[in-house]
């Protein structure tokens, strides 16, 4: 602890000027004081002043006014410090002395002579607060008040309790009177050093060093941090704890990115065809007679299918065809014929057979000829075989189709997919995405690849239902369920006509 | 107990970047009472203080060195990191990390056994 | 920038009492702290918040801090008492050491 003692003397009075032992000074009594702060005492004796000793210059002759004077000698009010806790009781002398030396330093002066002395015993709280008090004997009076207050930084009842104001990372605060910390605006803690962070701030998502601050644990965002951040990449879906993708209503695959209900949200399918939420690229269109194309959206020539027999050569017309038949012929599609056998209507070598009594025949073509005189070479790409765009290309006998980027086959009917470089490692299933593919990872397995072998296996607690297969590797800690044909779902809980093994991520 | 233990390279090249690292173990790094300091001392000189971390990743660094000094914490391996870059031969120092307590007032009350850095080509 | 002064040496004869005195502007309004440091040893705190002693540190380590000053008073020293002995302070969020005193044990 630490505090000072504090005595104001304001007036001592001496009218005859006499010493204690009746004599009087000689001019007058040159009068300076000896303070002596022990502990408290019944009765007071002699000894060491324990809580110590103070002594004035000359402060007056024989009856004075002691004036406050703050600094050098003389200084009232007089000041005993002391470095220990205030026990709340003492023991007072004030000695008046008259000396015949120096104003100064009279202490040191031979020849010093007693004029009065006084004791106070007693109880005395630390305060702010002078306690007044005048003593008389038969000669002298002395009026006085006295008082015990901290030093800076020490607190309390007896001055024990150290508290320095501070402003800084081990502690924002003032000193209450009682020496306790009163924390500065924005700051809590025992000791004033925690941050009082943005109203609102989630307890466990978010933090702050400084006041009015919310700082986002990794997986949040948002002001409060209390929105979670969905797994990177995921378009249609969201998310209820950090790096998930759950999929919003008809959308599937790992990022929610394959449209499962394209048909409907986007019509692409033309010109009355129907259209699928299924196929490679989400949807199929099943075009209605005399249309073709990806969407049905090319119109077919009336012409395409070659109505015309017998050599007839077809012309298109608005909403039909014509068919101008070669001489010999006739009828809508010139099928009827007004030659025989005798008129050698076989070309190419066909062999012509009479029929219905030899008024009409039928010609046997030889092979790549046809048509009802063996007219024409047989064009094996009439029938369009080739499908995704594919050109067709008659070589000999035989015909080729040549495929579009992407696809593959004899009639370009296998779409060629990223997954068969087979990019997955230890058994992981291949999804082929816009983006490229993406690996769905059996358990114990995790990365871009299912290259990472992980200690955790997600799928361990069988999180799956509905007969689906769990797979690890989308992130950390996370599993996949691929879903069997009717259910859906981050664990394929929901039974649901959708279509089947789409993945959906936990 | 807690311990402390600075490691990293002994020598460092002028111009380069000096890095250590200072384990903590017998206590949590994340603990809301104390921050981590490091301090260092020129042979035959006195301590430098160079800067300290809060497991949240709060910063405040000796205003002589706050343009080349960087200290980080990975509370998951309880260790905090040191980079001083641009070193000349006047960084050659014994640097310890230490433990600094708020409730004592910012004493350190556990510290490092050091490690001499030597810059030098 | 804050700093604080020492005397660079201060000699006792075994069983003496030794002040070491730590000088910085406004000081005392500051909490200031101890540290020993033996000759290829670390620092160890033997004075926090001016005067508390941590639990291990011998009684006759003691200290004070008012007006400018802070004081270390090791009461009757002794041989194994020889060593540095260094002053800290914060400055706002600046740790400041004092330059050090050499303690020796006549």
């Known amino acids: 602890g630490s505090g000072i003692f504090q005595l104001r003397l304001q007036e001592f009075v001496n009218q005859r000027g006499m010493l204690a032992n009746g004599q009087s000074c000689e001019p007058g009594c040159r009068t300076f004081f000896r303070i002596c702060l022990k502990h408290f005492q019944a009765t007071f004796s002699e000894g060491p002043c324990t809580f110590g000793n103070v002594s004035t210059p000359v402060l007056g002759t024989n009856s004075f006014v002691v004036r406050d004077k703050n600094s050098g000698s003389g200084r009232n009010p007089l000041q005993l410090p002391f470095n220990f806790t205030w026990p709340g009781t003492f023991s007072l002398n004030i000695q008046a002395w008259h000396t015949p030396g120096d104003d100064l330093r009279p202490e040191t002066s031979p020849g010093n002579s007693l004029i009065s002395q006084i004791i106070i015993q007693g109880s005395l709280a630390v305060g702010k607060i002078w306690r007044t008090d005048e003593q008389n004997d038969t000669l002298t009076r002395l009026s006085y008040s006295y008082r015990v207050i901290c030093s800076d930084n020490y607190y309390g009842e007896s001055c024990s309790r150290l508290c320095k104001k501070r402003d800084d990372h081990f502690g924002h605060y003032e000193c209450q009177p009682d020496g306790s910390l009163s924390c500065l605006p924005g700051w809590t803690g025992k000791y004033c050093d925690q941050p009082i962070c943005l109203s609102g701030c989630h307890e466990q998502n978010g933090y702050c060093s400084k006041p009015d601050e919310c700082i986002c644990r990794p997986g949040w965002q948002g002001r409060l941090c209390n929105e979670c951040i969905p797994h990177n990449g995921c378009r249609h879906g969201t998310c209820s704890i950090p790096w998930q993708c759950a999929c919003d209503e008809g959308w599937g695959g790992l990022f929610c990115d394959q449209d499962l209900n394209y048909c409907t949200h986007h019509s692409p399918c033309k010109n009355g065809s129907t259209c699928s939420n299924s196929g490679p690229k989400g949807y199929t269109c099943t075009c209605l007679p005399g249309y073709t194309g990806e969407h049905c959206e090319l119109g077919l020539s009336k012409c395409a299918s070659n109505p015309c027999r017998n050599g007839g050569s077809c012309k298109d017309q608005e909403n039909s065809y014509h068919c101008l038949c070669p001489p010999g012929y006739y009828g809508q599609h010139c099928e009827h014929s007004t030659l025989t056998c005798a008129d050698s209507p076989c070309f190419n070598g066909g062999s012509c057979r009479e029929r219905n009594q030899g008024s009409s025949y039928a010609c046997e073509c030889p092979p790549n000829f046809t048509g009802s005189n063996c007219e024409k070479k047989v064009d094996r790409c009439t029938s369009n075989p080739c499908a995704n765009g594919g050109q067709c290309q008659n070589r000999g006998p035989s015909r080729t189709c040549r495929c579009r980027p992407g696809f593959t086959g004899t009639h370009c009917e296998l779409h060629i997919s990223d997954c068969a470089r087979s990019p997955c490692a230890h058994g992981g299933t291949c999804h082929d995405l816009e983006n490229g593919p993406v690996c769905t990872c059996p358990a114990g397995f995790s990365g871009r690849r299912c290259e990472v072998r992980i200690t955790h296996d997600a799928c361990a607690s069988g999180p799956c239902f509905n007969g689906a297969t769990c797979y690890t590797g989308l992130s950390p800690n996370n599993f996949v369920c691929n879903c069997p044909y009717g259910f859906v779902g981050s664990r394929c809980e929901f039974p649901v006509g959708l279509p089947p093994s789409f993945p959906w991520v936990a | 107990e807690v311990q402390l233990q600075e490691s990293g390279p002994g020598l460092v090249k002028p111009s380069e970047t000096l890095s250590l690292t200072c384990t903590v173990s017998?206590?949590?790094?994340?603990?809301?009472?104390?921050?981590w300091g490091w301090i260092r001392q020129p042979p035959g000189k006195g301590l430098e203080w160079i800067g300290d971390i809060y497991y949240t990743g709060s910063t405040y660094y000796n205003p002589s060195l706050k343009s080349r000094v960087t200290i980080s914490v990975d509370t998951s391996k309880n260790q905090f990191s040191l980079k001083l870059s641009s070193v000349t031969a006047a960084d050659t120092a014994v640097y310890y990390c230490a433990r600094e307590a708020v409730p004592l007032g910012g004493g350190s009350d556990y510290w490092g056994q050091g490690t001499l850095v030597t810059v030098s080509s | 920038s804050y700093e604080l002064t020492q005397p660079p040496s201060v000699s006792v004869s075994p069983g003496q009492t030794a002040s070491i005195t730590c000088s910085g502007q406004?000081?005392?309004?500051?909490?200031a702290s101890w540290y020993q440091q033996k000759p290829g040893q670390s620092p160890v705190l033997v004075i926090y918040e001016d005067s508390k002693r941590p639990s291990g540190i011998p009684e006759r380590f003691s200290g004070s801090n008012s007006g400018d000053t802070a004081t270390l008073t090791i009461s009757g020293t002794q041989p194994m008492d020889e060593a540095d002995y260094y002053c800290?302070?914060?400055?706002?969020?600046?740790?400041?050491f004092g330059y050090g005193t050499k303690v020796t044990v006549l």
């Open positions: 406004r000081l005392g309004d500051k909490y």
């Open positions: 017998g206590g949590s790094i994340s603990s809301s009472s104390y921050y």
């Open positions: 800290q302070a914060w400055d706002r969020d600046t740790g400041v």
